[in-house]
Every structure is written in C-alpha cells, then in structure tokens.
C-alpha cells in the first residue's frame, strides 16, 4: 500500500501537557491485553520527514545490519532494499549475513504508480527500540523498484503490519508481526502514536523531522488523554473498520452509510490523506466549502494540488470545520466518534512562497478503493491495533496539534441502529480485491 499520497505534517500548538489527563474508565485497564503502563524504551522510536513516512530502526541478519523501515499498516510484507539504488544510502546485503536463508521464490508487487520486485528469504530481525527479542522473519529482498523509494526519505524498507491475506505473493507468506507473536511471548497487539512536527516548514526546515511511537506488545498510557474507544476489525486483511456516520461541523452528510465504506474502510499509516469514496468526498468537500464560505479557494486546492498560503501565524483555522467519523462500537447499536481539526487535514508544505508565509495542501482526497484513514486521521489519535481481540482503539493523542479553541476528540457512546448494514460486501472474484496502489 506504499506510494500514492504520503505522510504529512501539520501546524499549530503542541498537545496538552502530559500532566493534564482526562479521567479513564476504571474497568478499562483490566480489559487491555499485553503489558500495561510504560514502554519507555519504545516511546519516540519513530522518525521521518515531512510527507515521506514514519520509520522505525530495525536490524537484519548476523552480524546485524541496521536499516530504517517505514511503518505501514496498509500492507503485509516486510520488504527491504537489497541492491544499490540512487535513493538508498544503505541496503540489506544478504551475502554478509550468516543467518540468511533463501526461499528460492520471487515476489512482484505492482502499485497504481510504480512497483517493487525481489527475492524471498528469511533472516533474523530485531527492533533496537522495541521489545528485546530477535525473530526469524520473512524478508522480501527488493532488487528492482520503480517510484517506490523516496529520495532523501531516510528509509530503506517497509514493514507491512496488516494480515497475511494481503501478503504477496500469497497469504502463505507469514507477515512479520505474526512471526513476532508466534516466536515470543509478546502479546498480539501494537499501538501507534504519529505526531508530525507540529510546526509549519520553511526552506531551512523543508525536510523537518516528524516523530512518534510504535509500542509493540501493549499500550502506553502516557501517549493519550481520555479513554480508549474500540471499533471491531471487520475482517482481518487490511485493518478494516466500519464508519456509520460522517459529520462536518456537526452537520450529518446524510448518506447511506454503505457509501462511507465502499468498498472498504481501512486504517493505514502508509497513506498521508484522509481518502474518501468519490460520492462521500464530493459531499464532504461541498460541506467544508460551505462551512468556510467567507473565503473562497480555487478548485485545485480542493483537489489537493494547489497550495493556499497565509502570512505566518495568521492561518484562519476557525473558518474551517471539524470532521467527525462515527465508528461502529463494540456494543450492539452503539458507536463513537473521532473528530479531527483543520490542523490535521490542512497539511503544511515546505514554504514555496516566502518565509513570511504558512502554506498548506488540502489533505482530504478522493478514492476509488474505499475510505483510507491515513496520517491525517492517525496524527490526531493514539491508535491501538488490538489484534488479539480483533479491534482497533482510538484515544486523543497527547501530541496532536490543536489550538486554544478546539481539540481533536474521541467521544461516545452514541446510539446507532443497523450498523452491520453499513459494511460493503465485496464480490469475491480471484484477486480483484487486492488493489495495492494508494494513489
């Protein structure tokens, strides 16, 4: 699920101080699998550059070769550069690893734009700023690629954290996280806090660092405020969820909820934007335009192409509405909503006007493959991928960007009937569902 539109940064104030926590439900903690409380060694283990993805440091082989690996919940292959490439400073050298085993099998992954191909093998893998374990995992050694690696991104591979069903070449290739859980006592859960830089970029900061945390094996309470709300994983392929209602500034889009999930809705750390099905996108943009009608912007802005700039510090956040997605809850006829701010869906772009300007792209876009809750959503929240209990949790991120008037929110419960009807049933024909591209 790599490529397409990649990850963003935002502008605004930092999150609330860690001391200012909302009360949690008393029974919540006992329901959480895995270690509880503090995962100090894993906090802040993600890095990246504006628009180029969040990566974690990993080691592969014996002796260990250190590589930066893009964290992608929208795919299921662990794949690393394994041959010289103009955009790679380093790559996996299989011949130098005494523990490499060749599976004598190739893999080819095409995207809407671009592709990668390589050779399958296994080797020993660990995460220095992760759990203190080493596992033997499947590795796709990328030998050829087109429009996959990003110049200057500082990552050399991709860690697909979704399920085996969408692994390439087929679902018999065990994904990394499955191997990790099978070979260790690590609980079958991980969580992501994607933070962004929290400031607009200028020429000297045009490749400013973003940061975040990937907590493997549990939940770190220092990374969120309020309580976690869980939505069921509908099907274990992508991290598929069901959206039951969409609001712009509290105004219901009033669409058949099947439209919101046509043909699926997924949580994907490897996509920048909030991507919406065509009909939903058109309705949402119409509503956002109406809410911000005191100012008009060109069509190219709403298409995510043109930048709109304001004098530094004068971005009129208040004229842009909040976007709320209601997700199916764990209890029958109960939902909860996650609300993002314009600070999430207007993403700062390195200053192409002047250093006195803050410039943004609209980071909600149209999709032909369903809703994709990319970084635009994830940067507002601490997201728990509770694979053990087949659910995804959302709480307000302690590092999300907001202002003094509004904050991202996770709220519930709401009564919503017939939520099962909101899911779209994809006709099963060969591999027609495996649309890998994320344009």
């Amino acid at each position: 699920t790599h490529l397409g539109i990649r990850l963003p940064l935002r502008s605004g104030l930092a999150g609330p101080p860690l001391g200012l926590r909302l009360p949690r439900e008393t029974d919540e903690e006992s329901e959480e699998p895995g270690r509880r409380g503090s995962f100090v060694e894993m906090v802040d283990n993600l890095r990246g550059k504006s628009g180029q993805g969040y990566y974690v440091e990993m080691t592969v082989g014996s002796p260990p070769q250190t590589l930066n690996i893009l964290v992608d919940t929208g795919s299921s292959n662990f794949a690393v550069g394994a041959a010289p490439h103009p955009f790679l400073h380093r790559y996996y050298q299989r011949q130098l690893s005494s523990t490499y085993r060749d599976l004598r099998k190739g893999v080819y992954v095409p995207y809407t734009q671009g592709k990668w191909e390589g050779e399958l093998g296994t080797d020993l893998v660990s995460i220095p700023h992760g759990p203190n374990v080493t596992v033997r995992a499947n590795i796709a050694a990328i030998t050829e690629s087109d429009k996959f690696f990003i110049n200057g991104s500082n990552w050399e591979g991709i860690l697909g954290l979704a399920y085996a069903e969408i692994a390439r070449p087929d679902d018999s290739l065990e994904p990394f996280f499955d191997s990790l859980v099978k070979q260790t006592h690590i609980p079958n859960i991980f969580s992501l806090q994607l933070c962004g830089a929290g400031f607009p970029l200028n020429q000297t900061e045009a490749l400013a660092s973003v940061g975040g945390s990937m907590i493997i094996g549990g939940i770190d309470h220092s990374l969120y405020t309020g309580r976690l709300w869980y939505t069921p994983i509908r099907r274990e392929w992508y991290y598929e969820v069901i959206i039951v209602r969409v609001e712009i500034n509290g105004q219901d889009l009033k669409m058949d909820c099947k439209e919101y999930n046509y043909d699926k809705s997924i949580v994907d750390s490897g996509t920048t934007n909030l991507r919406l099905p065509k009909k939903v996108f058109e309705a949402a943009v119409k509503s956002i335009k109406a809410a911000s009608s005191t100012e008009k912007f060109p069509d190219g802005f709403w298409l995510g192409e043109q930048l709109v700039c304001w004098q530094a510090g004068t971005t009129p956040w208040n004229i842009f509405p909040v976007i709320s997605l209601y997700l199916m809850g764990e209890v029958t006829n109960q939902s909860f909503r996650i609300t993002i701010l314009p600070q999430q869906y207007l993403r700062p772009v390195e200053d192409v006007a002047t250093s006195q300007d803050d410039c943004y792209k609209f980071a909600v876009s149209q999709s032909s493959t369903g809703t994709v809750m990319g970084a635009v959503i994830m940067e507002g929240f601490y997201v728990v991928f509770d694979r053990a209990r087949k659910r995804i949790g959302f709480a307000v991120s302690a590092c999300h960007v907001h202002d003094e008037f509004r904050t991202a929110a996770v709220e519930g419960p709401f009564v919503t009937a017939d939520m099962e009807d909101c899911g779209y049933n994809i006709p099963q024909t060969d591999e027609s569902t495996l649309m890998t591209g994320r344009a």
Epitope: T294, P298, D299, A353
Partner: antibody, heavy 120, light 108 residues
Amino acid sequence: QLQLQESGPGLVKPSETLSLTCTVSGGSISWSSYYWSWIRQPPGKGLEWIGNIYYSGSTYYNPSLKSRVTISVDTSKNQFSLKLSSVTAADTAVYYCARLGHGYNYFDLWGRGTLVTVSS
Amino acid sequence: EIVLTQSPATLSLSPGERATLSCRASQSVSSYLAWFQQKPGQAPRLLIYDASNRATGIPARFSGSGSGTDFTLTISSLEPEDFAVYYCQQVYVWPPRTFGGGTKVEIK
C-alpha cells in the same frame, strides 16, 4: 460588459498614504466567482501583486507589503480600494486593479492602470 | 519562494516568423501557469491559463505547453500586433503572486 477603472491622485508625497479606488461597472462586485486584486508595475519593470479582496471582506496581501497595505470593499458602491502607507519613491508605479477569475486563479480582466508618482 | 525565469530577455523576429518563449520555475508548479501579453501603455492581457488553455478571444496562433518546471509560449506566425512584452505567472501557490521577469518580442 464588465469594466474596471482605477481612480485617485497621481502624485503622493513621501511618507504619506497612497489611496486608490477601483470602480467595477457592468457587473456586481458581489459575484461569488471572483476575487478583486491590486497589482503594480514600476516604470520599465515587471509586475508585482499587492493583494486581493473577496466581496465578504476577506483579504490576502503580499507579505513584503503587508505591514503597509489595506484593501477594502464597498459593495454598495461596487468599489474596492487600496491604501498604501508610508510611501517612498520606490512605490512609484502604474497601479492596476484586476479581477481574479477562472476559479479564483487568473487575472482575467484588468483596469487600464493609473500612474502614481511619489515625490515631494 | 518559487522563482520564474523567462528566456530570452529579448527576442528579435520578423512578422510571419515563429516565436518560442520559455518560462522556467524553480520548482514544480504542476500546470498552474498563465501567460500575459502587455503592449506599451496598456494593461496586461491574459493569453493562456492552466499552461495550455487559450483565454476567451485569443487567436489560435498563441499556444502554451509544458508542466512541472518548464513551460513554453509559442506564437506560430507573428503578426505586427504581437510585438509586446510577455509575462508568465504561476498560481500553484495561491493566492497568485509570482510573475516572471518578462520577454520582449521586438521587430527585427
């Protein structure tokens, strides 16, 4: 047919405020499809965008001039105005008003321009 | 800041000849580029928008091409009234603000 016409003094003293008005005729300044703009051109030189205004009063200014520029709109008179404070000889230019059309992107209609000289 | 560089600064040609004017952006502006014509003592006139679309009333001899960083305005056969200064302008960054320095097309 829509037309734009600039008006105002042709001579302004240094440190004073330059004031110009653009009158829109043959159509309404309140059309939602357009922003209204000021652009200037020093003698023998290129074009410099000064700023835009929407009929609602929403403004955008060139960052390099922002501290000295005010653009306002009077929908009842079908006019928009430019004020540039603390002028110097470097502000001597032909000042054009223009319509920003084609989806708010392009200056598709211009006034004839008025020369403003800053001199004591 | 996106800088638009026009070349050549001056183009000396005869009526009936083909004129090719270049505008190069310091970074990609997609296809968000316009061309203007300005005659002495007159306001600029929009010729081309979105890199290749002719504005209303512009003769077919004017054509625009390019995307990304390199753009071209072509006048297929110069008429006497085409001798003027031509400016390009990018609107990738909005509101529109950046003009090129201009190319003067003069009679040889």
